[in-house]
Interface confidence: low
């Protein structure tokens, strides 16, 4: 499976959507900031094998598509943004799901290392628990797009480094 | 083997809701979402939307929104699916489908219930 | 919405000829998610193809399928009296996922 130069274009261009979408100061939010706890490990990519990290990306992408596919999100967010947001992740979705299928192969092989996926969808459980919290308050959702800008950039060098991997 | 067993035929009447449900066994229940998709007599198929069974996060088609509600119980790997002010042309038999990758999505459907909805 | 249009809406043949239904799509499809499912009378409908050429687990070999973007066909080679059946195309590649209306083969 060969995640190629246009997945890491998708990538780039995720990042800078993201970047686009901050509608106030992280300063003036500073009181709101909060430790996501997110899954470092997880993307550290030298203990397993393609196919579980990928597993692991592919989770990382629809974790953050159903994240920012919510009504409250579509209430946050420039529409236009948020649909090429969606655009962007879907392709990257697309792209790994096609390596999973090379990578696995077998029908019956669950996503990958259950462990690995739920730590990853607990940090998302945090960050939506977080969401409620705070009400959906712009500050929370500018805490939250920070952080995803930041896992975004962990999914990206773990990218990266499979590609080097090829 | 992966097996989707369905609760049995529904008779309603306009504007009651109907639930159907979806016992999934034979494999990791929160590894896969669960889709439903429906059938009016001699009509195509129509996909209705998707529950992840994991935390319960749905995705819906426009079509149904507001109508429908999906919701799983991890205790007992059963999804529902849930149609509320139900109408005539509401008549069809309900699926549910299992989701996954290349080969293994909507590979397995569930036996089908019929809901009829009558005066 | 991706309108996926099938044709013909009946296609009427005896068995040993090849069958050829069709399946445009209304904006570009990723093939990746371009799906064939065969469904009989009172039955569920049962997967044929996925990945638009791809067999799925226990399908004869006389099915195929072909295409790409908006174009998508469903082959079989030599008909057998079992599958005379009515055939969804189907495509998870963007929201909300949609089938064809489906083409009825059946004998001549």
């Known amino acids: 499976c060969n995640l190629s130069q246009t997945h890491s274009l998708n990538n780039r261009r995720t990042l800078m959507l993201m970047a686009q979408m901050r509608r106030i100061s992280p300063f003036s939010c500073l009181k709101d900031r909060h430790d996501f706890e997110f899954p470092q490990e997880e993307f550290d990519g030298n203990q397993f094998q393609k196919a579980q990290a990928i597993s692991v990306l592919h989770e990382m992408m629809q974790q953050t598509f159903n994240l920012f596919s919510t009504k409250n999100s579509s209430a946050a967010w420039d529409e236009t943004l948020l649909e090429k947001f969606y655009i962007e992740l879907f392709q990257q979705m697309n792209d790994l799901e096609a390596c999973v299928i090379q990578e696995v192969g077998v029908e019956e092989t669950p996503l990958m290392n259950e462990d690995s996926i739920l730590a990853v969808k607990k940090y998302f459980q945090r960050i939506t628990l977080y969401l409620m919290e705070k009400k959906y308050s712009p500050c929370a959702w500018e805490v939250v797009r920070a952080e995803i800008m930041r896992s975004l950039s962990f999914s990206t060098n773990l990218q990266k480094r499979l590609r080097r991997k090829d | 083997q992966v097996q989707l067993v369905q609760s049995g035929a529904e008779v309603k009447k306009p504007g009651a809701s109907v639930k159907v449900s979806c016992k999934a066994s034979g494999y990791t229940f929160t590894n896969y979402w669960m889709h439903w998709v429906r059938q009016a007599p001699g009509q195509g198929l129509e996909w209705m939307g998707e529950i992840n069974p994991s935390h319960g996060r749905t995705i819906y088609a426009q079509k149904f929104q507001g109508r429908v509600t999906m919701t799983r119980d991890t205790s007992t790997s059963t999804v529902y699916m849930e149609l509320s002010s139900l109408r005539s042309e509401d008549t069809a038999v309900y699926y549910c489908?299992?989701?996954?990758?290349?080969?293994?999505?909507?590979?397995?459907w569930g036996q089908g219930t019929l809901v009829t909805v009558s005066s | 919405e991706i309108v996926l249009t099938q044709s013909p809406a009946t296609l009427s043949l005896s068995p040993g000829e090849r069958a050829t239904l069709s399946c445009s799509a209304g904006?570009?499809?990723?093939?990746?998610?371009l799906y064939w499912y065969q469904q009989k009378p009172g039955q569920a409908p049962r997967l044929l193809i996925y990945?638009?050429?791809n067999l799925a687990s226990g399908i004869p070999a006389r099915f195929s399928g072909s295409g790409s973007g908006t174009d998508f066909t469903l082959t079989i080679s030599s008909l057998e009296p079992e599958d005379f059946a009515v055939y969804y195309c189907h495509q998870w590649s963007s929201y909300p996922f949609t089938f064809g209306q489906g083409t009825k083969l059946e004998i001549k």
């Open positions: 990945s638009t050429s």
């Open positions: 904006s570009s499809v990723d093939s990746s998610y």
């Open positions: 489908a299992r989701g996954g990758l290349g080969p293994a999505w909507f590979a397995y």
